[in-house]
Amino acid sequence: TQHGIRLPLRSGLGGAPLGLRLPRETDEEPEEPGRRGSFVEMVDNLRGKSGQGYYVEMTVGSPPQTLNILVDTGSSNFAVGAAPHPFLHRYYQRQLSSTYRDLRKGVYVPYTQGKWEGELGTDLVSIPHGPNVTVRANIAAITESDKFFINGSNWEGILGLAYAEIARPDDSLEPFFDSLVKQTHVPNLFSLQLCGAGFPLNQSEVLASVGGSMIIGGIDHSLYTGSLWYTPIRREWYYEVIIVRVEINGQDLKMDCKEYNYDKSIVDSGTTNLRLPKKVFEAAVKSIKAASSTEKFPDGFWLGEQLVCWQAGTTPWNIFPVISLYLMGEVTNQSFRITILPQQYLRPVEDVATSQDDCYKFAISQSSTGTVMGAVIMEGFYVVFDRARKRIGFAVSACHVHDEFRTAAVEGPFVTLDMEDCGYNIPQTDESTLMTGRA
């Protein structure tokens, strides 16, 4: 939900067609009753389209009105279209809901590239392919927007899953997940498996496909392989974490680790790209260019503006390096690394001119607001947002796209000293200068 290529996110298919799935490994962590195991009813409850966001079906009001809602860990408002809009097939009609309550308050939310405003109220909300509960939640009824809704995306609202600190108009507006936990017995955690397709999807393919899973209140073993590794949530506003080291094909970028987290590093399902602070982006691109120098790409490609295409099935994945981010671990002086493949950071797009080619955009971009671990990162991993224990877990996703030579990885432990020094302390400024997630 940060800036850059935000909100509009990309998704894809789950299941076998996604490419090779890794075999399950035994889970070394002890069971935590009520939080781990099988959540069959929630598996495969996300859909989406490359670059346009992963969404879950929700119902709002009485009688229930069904809407598709973008899952966004980079913002904290639950907001739905509530007026006709050219890009919406349907919208929330408050006047038809007997349980709607007007909060008599307006709200305005600017993202980097989109904005909306609306009126606050509360209503009964449930997630059909989620926990079997109904909660009264705050809802922003969007009455006016600019570059927010996306033509053909098939979602009509946004579910901000981050913390109250970044809710608009202020932190007194309780976010949906807080209401859910407070009003039910759902444990205070959720997990996301976002499944990139590895190839572009047309409208009908998206509607027929699975884009992943949002497991509310728990962890599903079938969605990941190997072990879960946890990094502390540094501060409960965005899902802020600390990156302590970055490697391209095993080569350390050798920057002051504060640069990696300037001015923050967040995990954001509502952003398409891996977004990096200017200095880090420049160093990373330089290193990726060097590693892939057997082929030359135009500058526009590295800026995320131009496609590169190869004849179908001939994409030279092997010339592109893997990227490893080392995250602060739960134990003092201990870190772990998550490694993504070019299959994650080269985003498949449809080439208008020739459908015989496989075309891609470079999905790493520059940020002025810190590191954003968007879909490019998340599509490689099963990500556990363990709010109860103030930590985020990463494991290799059972649906990540890879080839026969390399897979995404989560590995540790590594010894890393003085990791606390890697965090950047944002000077206290007026809260009103905060940009809410998305772009």
Epitope: R104, G106, V107, Y108, K115, E117, T143, E144, D170, S432
Partner: antibody, heavy 124, light 107 residues
Framework: EVQLLESGGGLVQPGGSLRLSCAAS????????MGWVRQAPGKGLEWVSA????????YYADSVKGRFTISRDNSKNTLYLQMNSLRAEDTAVYYC?????????????????WGQGTLVTVSS | EIVLTQSPATLSLSPGERATLSCRAS??????LAWYQQKPGQAPRLLIY???NRATGIPARFSGSGSGTDFTLTISSLEPEDFAVYYC?????????FGGGTKVEIK
């Protein structure tokens, strides 16, 4: 220079209707929220209604809800206030005001300048 | 409804003096509060928005402060043209409401 010129005021009987207009110039009308504020003779100010730039967001004071309708014609750079079922307490000078942005609820998006007003008198 | 109470109702001061006008909200309006000035026979004009930001073209002698429920408009040194009625207004909650006004008159 921004200009806002209200018209359509006058004397009307209780229960009657009037339509106020506000002709705007000197700025991109469609990219600004617009509003109506009224002031009864010798009294303070009261917000009546406001609309966002495209007309998606609309605000009404409780005292006029269901009786007054705000609308805008962005092709004519004109804001309207249709007032039905008028009451004696609606007697006031009605000011048209320009918003600070297209948004109705954005911080910083306050209303300024205002027109010189048009007097509406509801009396039998 | 949020009630804005302005005090004093009238402030009698001489040019060059400092004027301090108060606006108290019946519940928090965060920083969604503005101040307008109105002279006889004229439309109001915006002085301060979002509690403390000076509107375009407003002299530096006007300043606003406060958040939540207590707000102050200060005119550091009154000029002859500053004698007028001052209104605070909130847009935090519906209905948007004005205070009753403070009249600053020449002593």
């Amino acid at each position: 220079e921004v200009q806002l010129l209200e018209s359509g005021g006058g004397l009307v009987q209780p229960g009657g209707s009037l339509r106020l207009s506000c002709a705007a110039s000197g700025f991109t009308f469609s990219s600004r929220a617009m509003g109506w504020v009224r002031q009864a003779p010798g009294k303070g100010l009261e917000w009546v209604s406001a609309t966002s730039g495209s007309g998606g967001s609309i605000y009404y004071a409780d005292s006029v809800k269901g009786r007054f309708t705000i609308s805008r014609d962005n092709s004519k750079n004109t804001l309207y206030l249709q007032m039905n079922s008028l009451r004696a307490e609606d007697t006031a000078v009605y000011y048209c005001a320009k918003g600070g942005s297209q948004w109705l609820y954005a911080p910083g998006s306050w209303f300024d300048p205002w027109g010189q007003g048009t007097l509406v008198t509801v009396s039998s | 409804e949020i009630v804005l109470t302005q005090s004093p109702a009238t402030l009698s001061l001489s040019p060059g003096e400092r004027a301090t006008l108060s606006c108290r909200a019946s519940q928090s309006v965060s920083s969604y509060l503005a101040w307008y000035q109105q002279k006889p026979g004229q439309a109001p004009r915006l002085l301060i928005y979002d509690a403390s930001n000076r509107a375009t073209g407003i002299p530096a002698r006007f300043s606003g402060s406060g958040s939540g429920t207590d707000f102050t408009l200060t005119i550091s040194s009154l000029e002859p043209e500053d004698f007028a009625v001052y209104y605070c207004v909130q847009r935090s909650n519906f209905p948007w409401t004005f205070g009753g006004g403070t009249k600053v008159e020449i002593k």
